[in-house]
């Protein structure tokens, strides 16, 4: 049940990431650590790296408020789960600083990709033989 709540939150975050992608030109063009091809059992660690990243509005134009609200939603801590706690204790997961740094557009694309991977794993785990290739 807790894991379900977590994944439902991940699904909602995908929409927020997609919204932010529409305002990518209004974000500070700073390079941010962007995990990619995250190894199994390090997904939650990578997720926290995305949440910690200093994604910022460039404070230009009319979009500043909606951007700041979306960034705040992205950074909202999800409820703790056993899976998350287990992974926190994995000392083998790369540190946030070790991940390649990317500009906001690629950062958001990689964040979305991780969220999709986590949801897909969750969905697949409920179904025997669902993964065909």
């Amino acid at each position: 049940q807790g894991q379900d709540r977590h994944m439902i939150r991940m699904r909602q975050l995908i929409d927020i990431v997609d919204q932010l992608k529409n305002y990518v030109n209004d974000l500070v063009p700073e390079f941010l650590p962007a995990p990619e091809d995250v190894e199994t059992n390090c997904e939650w660690s990578a997720f926290s790296c995305f949440q910690k990243a200093q994604l910022k509005s460039a404070n230009t134009g009319n979009n500043e408020r909606i951007i700041n609200v979306s960034i705040k939603k992205l950074k909202r801590k999800p409820p703790s789960t056993n899976a998350g706690r287990r992974q926190k204790h994995r000392l083998t997961c790369p540190s946030c600083d070790s991940y390649e740094k990317k500009p906001p557009k690629e950062f958001l694309e990689r964040f979305k990709s991780l969220l999709q991977k986590m949801i897909h794993q969750h969905l697949s785990s409920r179904t025997h033989g669902s993964e065909d290739s």
Partner: antibody, heavy 117, light 107 residues
Framework: QVQLQESGPGLVKPSETLSLTCTVS????????WGWIRQPPGKGLEWIGY???????NYNPSLKSRVTISVDTSRNQFSLKLSSVTAADTAVYYC???????????WGQGTLVTVSS | DIQMTQSPSSVSASVGDRVTITCRAS??????LAWYQHKPGKAPKLLIY???SLQSGVPSRFSGSGSGTDFTLTISSLQPEDFATYYC?????????FGGGTKVEIK
């Protein structure tokens, strides 16, 4: 705004292979999940399967032995192949995007495929 | 497979009416439910995902509720463009499955 357009023959003979292509515009196929759903005349929607931009697939077990979904990122297209078709495969076939993995946020308008000799 | 049962199969209503459509899953699906609107010859449109989250660009007169096995789509004040067929879809496990549809017709 992402747009999807199905294309392929509207008539397929029994025992042959149904082949459809979905062309994606207004967005890149190199992220998200891309799926096929069908609707036989007078019936409800049936999920056929989907493919991730990286090529991993999930298929409906009821069709799994006959279905192949593939993606061509260079052409921004993905395709469906359904082998050994019968009259029961007559349906409107829709292609769709799944950004959220669990639901389909953009769909094509659908194409009717009739299986008949 | 998880069976999705929608009721009613059709409903006649007038502009301004409040319309409620229900969807029942054959087993618990948490909040893994989406709702779609489909008009003949048009592309289906996602309205609601994870039971109650409104898809971007969808009018606020549409709302979804429920969890477990029983779910509801509500149109608070029916508009002329809302006459269509509505489908629910579960995503708790593969294969993804749809309800049989509810046709909203003009009274």
């Amino acid at each position: 705004q992402v747009q999807l357009q199905e294309s392929g023959p509207g008539l397929v003979k029994p025992s042959e292979t149904l082949s459809l292509t979905c062309t994606v515009s207004g967005g890149s196929i190199s992220s998200d999940f891309w799926g096929w759903i069908r609707q036989p005349p007078g019936k409800g929607l049936e999920w056929i399967g989907y493919i991730s931009s990286r090529g991993s697939t999930n298929y409906n077990p009821s069709l799994k032995s006959r279905v192949t979904i593939s993606v061509d990122t260079s052409r921004n297209q993905f395709s469906l192949k359904l082998s050994s078709v019968t009259a029961a495969d007559t349906a409107v076939y829709y292609c769709a995007r799944s950004a959220g993995v669990t639901d389909f946020d953009f769909w094509g308008q659908g194409t009717l495929v009739t299986v008949s000799s | 497979d998880i069976q999705m049962t929608q009721s009613p199969s059709s409903v006649s209503a007038s502009v301004g009416d409040r319309v409620t459509i229900t969807c029942r899953a054959s087993q618990g699906i948490s909040s893994w439910l989406a709702w779609y609107q489909h008009k003949p010859g048009k592309a289906p449109k996602l309205l609601i995902y994870v039971a109650s989250s409104l898809q971007s660009g969808v009018p606020s007169r549409f709302s979804g509720s429920g969890s477990g096995t029983d779910f509801t789509l509500t149109i608070s004040s029916l508009q002329p463009e809302d006459f269509a067929t509505y489908y629910c879809q579960q995503a708790n496990s593969f294969p993804l499955t749809f309800g049989g549809g509810t046709k909203v017709e003009i009274k």
